[in-house]
């Protein structure tokens, strides 16, 4: 806490300007009116205040707005935002996307801090859902943002927002998240033609079921190995050798390099060796000729 002391004669601040950087902490506390500071917040960022001075300015705003800052002040916080705690931010009501952008800009280039996470949480909850503009903004600043959400939170993303998602935004998503996002993407892109559709849906395919992969195999999509390796193992296992060959097109040769890795390894174990041999890739580990394949999962279902 900064002690309350009278402002020395002639030092009362009439505006927020460069002269204040020479004020000691107690002088800032005594000589800067909190209401003046609130109305001229945009100037604070234009002045190279020190850490300690910024602490005093924050303290003055906290005293003026004990219930939380109004959006008119929040929008102009600039670098003072980095002084805020998650507890401070939970008191705010941020509704403007412009305010959100202004504060995210301050943290640009850094990892998502607890302050930013709290700010985004407050903003999204206030809006009720992750609309396209918000998602556009958040993924522009934090490409990994979508993948930081739980499947439950992702369920509030409307399919229309999926258009804002770029492939790199999904890099760190796990299968559970892609399971939620894939049906939304399928819905969002449903009116696109074959090749355009595949380009858009490709990065979401880690959530695709077997029947959708079978359908894609009929469309000459030439899926690359990197995408294939991200598919759900349980979705790949039922695919026949012919279907995988059609799905991958010229990329099928890449299976050899991946034969020890999932899902390729597990898929090979489910295929007849004769069928694998038709690929001419030297894939080994299939079911030997003459062996009977029992689908135990079907048997369990019947009993």
């Amino acid at each position: 806490e900064v002690e309350k002391t009278a402002c020395p004669s002639g030092k009362k601040a009439r505006e927020i300007d460069e002269s204040l950087i020479f004020y000691k902490k107690w002088e800032l506390e005594a000589c800067v009116d909190a209401a003046l500071l609130a109305t001229q917040m945009d100037r604070v960022n234009a002045i190279p205040f020190t850490y300690e001075q910024l602490d005093v300015l924050k303290h003055k705003l906290d005293e003026l707005y004990p219930q939380g800052y109004p959006e008119s002040v929040i929008q102009h916080l600039g670098y003072l935002f980095l002084k805020m705690s998650p507890e401070d931010i939970r008191k705010w009501n941020v509704t403007s996307l412009e305010t959100l952008k202004a504060l995210l800009e301050v943290n640009k280039g850094h990892e998502m801090s607890p302050q930013v996470a709290t700010l985004i949480d407050r903003f999204v909850k206030g809006r009720g859902q992750l609309d396209k503009d918000t998602l556009d903004t958040l993924t522009a600043f934090y490409p990994g943002y979508l993948c930081s959400l739980s499947p439950e939170e992702l369920s509030s993303v409307p399919p229309s927002s999926i258009w804002a998602v770029r492939p790199q935004d999904l890099d760190t998503c796990d299968p559970r998240q892609l399971d939620v996002l894939y049906p939304k993407a399928r819905l969002a892109f449903q009116n696109m033609n074959g090749s355009e559709y595949f380009v858009k849906i490709q990065s979401f395919l880690g959530g695709a079921p077997t029947e959708d992969l079978k359908a894609l195999s009929q469309q000459n999509v030439s899926m690359d190995l990197a995408t294939f390796m991200k598919l759900r193992t349980d979705a790949v296992l039922p695919l026949t050798v012919a279907e995988v060959q059609k799905l991958l097109g010229p990329h099928v040769e890449g299976l050899k390099a991946e034969e020890r890795h999932r899902p390729v390894r597990d898929w090979i174990l489910r295929q007849r060796q004769d069928d694998l041999d038709t690929l001419g890739l030297g894939l080994q580990g299939g079911i030997p000729n003459g062996y009977l394949v029992l689908d135990l999962s079907m048997q369990e279902a019947l009993s």
Epitope: E18, A46, T50, Y51, E52, Q53
Partner: antibody
Framework: QVQLVQSGAEVKKSGESLKISCKGS????????IAWVRQMPGKGLEWMGI????????IYSPYFQGQVTISADKSISTAYLQWSSLKASDTAMYYC???????????????WGQGTTVTVSS | DIRLTQSPSSLSASLGDRVTITCRAS??????LAWYQQKPGKAPRLLIY???TLESGVPSRFSGSGSGTDFTLTISSLQPEDFATYYC?????????FGGGTKLEIK
């Protein structure tokens, strides 16, 4: 790459005027403060003042206020330090340095010019 | 103004030595302190800021510590290129001030 390039060495007589320059490149020159720092022969570093080229706001150290003028021309990414009447005691190495800028309360000098030697004879 | 006192003012050491330079502020400055290296005829170079954060590109043998009034710069194992003069600078309040420097020489 990010750099500050200063004008060459100057030899002057007492009472003459002088303007030395510092040209920035490789970054948004208008978005960072530029500082001037003096180093007298065999001595330490002294902060003289800073300028924000974006709008030419200047903050002088109380010890150099009225002794020098700091200015900038954002259009050519150049900051200046000038004297209207040099004294022998102005003999020193003068450095420009990038200061703070759009980072939070970063009041240190991360990029430096190579320095300009000013020699003033009486 | 905040005065910074560096000690020692000069220091002789050998290659591979561990060296510590101290900087004492005339009043508490939190962690608002930077360290610079200056070689003869060259401009200073930022090594450490915020008392302990290594500037990018600076070798990890350099480290900084301290807060309040007492700070240290440590070089864990001296290399030939480390012989120079080192300055501390406070960023807690204006006017910004530097320490008087510590000249590190080869023994």
């Amino acid at each position: 790459q990010v750099q500050l390039v200063q004008s060459g060495a100057e030899v002057k007589k007492s009472g003459e005027s002088l303007k030395i320059s510092c040209k920035g490149s490789g970054y948004g020159f208008g978005a960072y403060w530029i500082a001037w720092v003096r180093q007298m022969p065999g001595k330490g570093l002294e902060w003289m003042g800073i300028i924000y080229p974006g709008d030419s706001r200047v903050i002088y150290s109380p010890y150099f206020q009225g002794q020098v003028t700091i200015s900038a021309d954002k259009s050519i990414s150049t900051a200046y330090l000038q004297w209207s009447s040099l004294k022998a005691s102005d003999t020193a190495m003068y450095y420009c340095a990038r200061f703070g800028g759009p980072k939070f309360a970063t009041n240190w000098f991360d990029i430096w010019g190579q320095g300009t030697t000013v020699t003033v004879s009486s | 103004d905040i005065r910074l006192t560096q000690s020692p003012s000069s220091l002789s050491a050998s290659l591979g030595d561990r060296v510590t330079i101290t900087c004492r502020a005339s009043q508490a400055i939190s962690s608002a302190l930077a360290w610079y290296q200056q070689k003869p005829g060259k401009a200073p170079r930022l090594l450490i800021y915020d008392a302990s954060t290594l500037e990018s590109g600076v070798p990890s043998r350099f480290s900084g510590s301290g807060s309040g009034t007492d700070f240290t710069l440590t070089i864990s194992s001296l290399q030939p290129e480390d012989f120079a003069t080192y300055y501390c600078q406070q960023a807690d309040s204006f006017p910004l001030t530097f320490g008087g420097g510590t000249k590190l020489e080869i023994k």
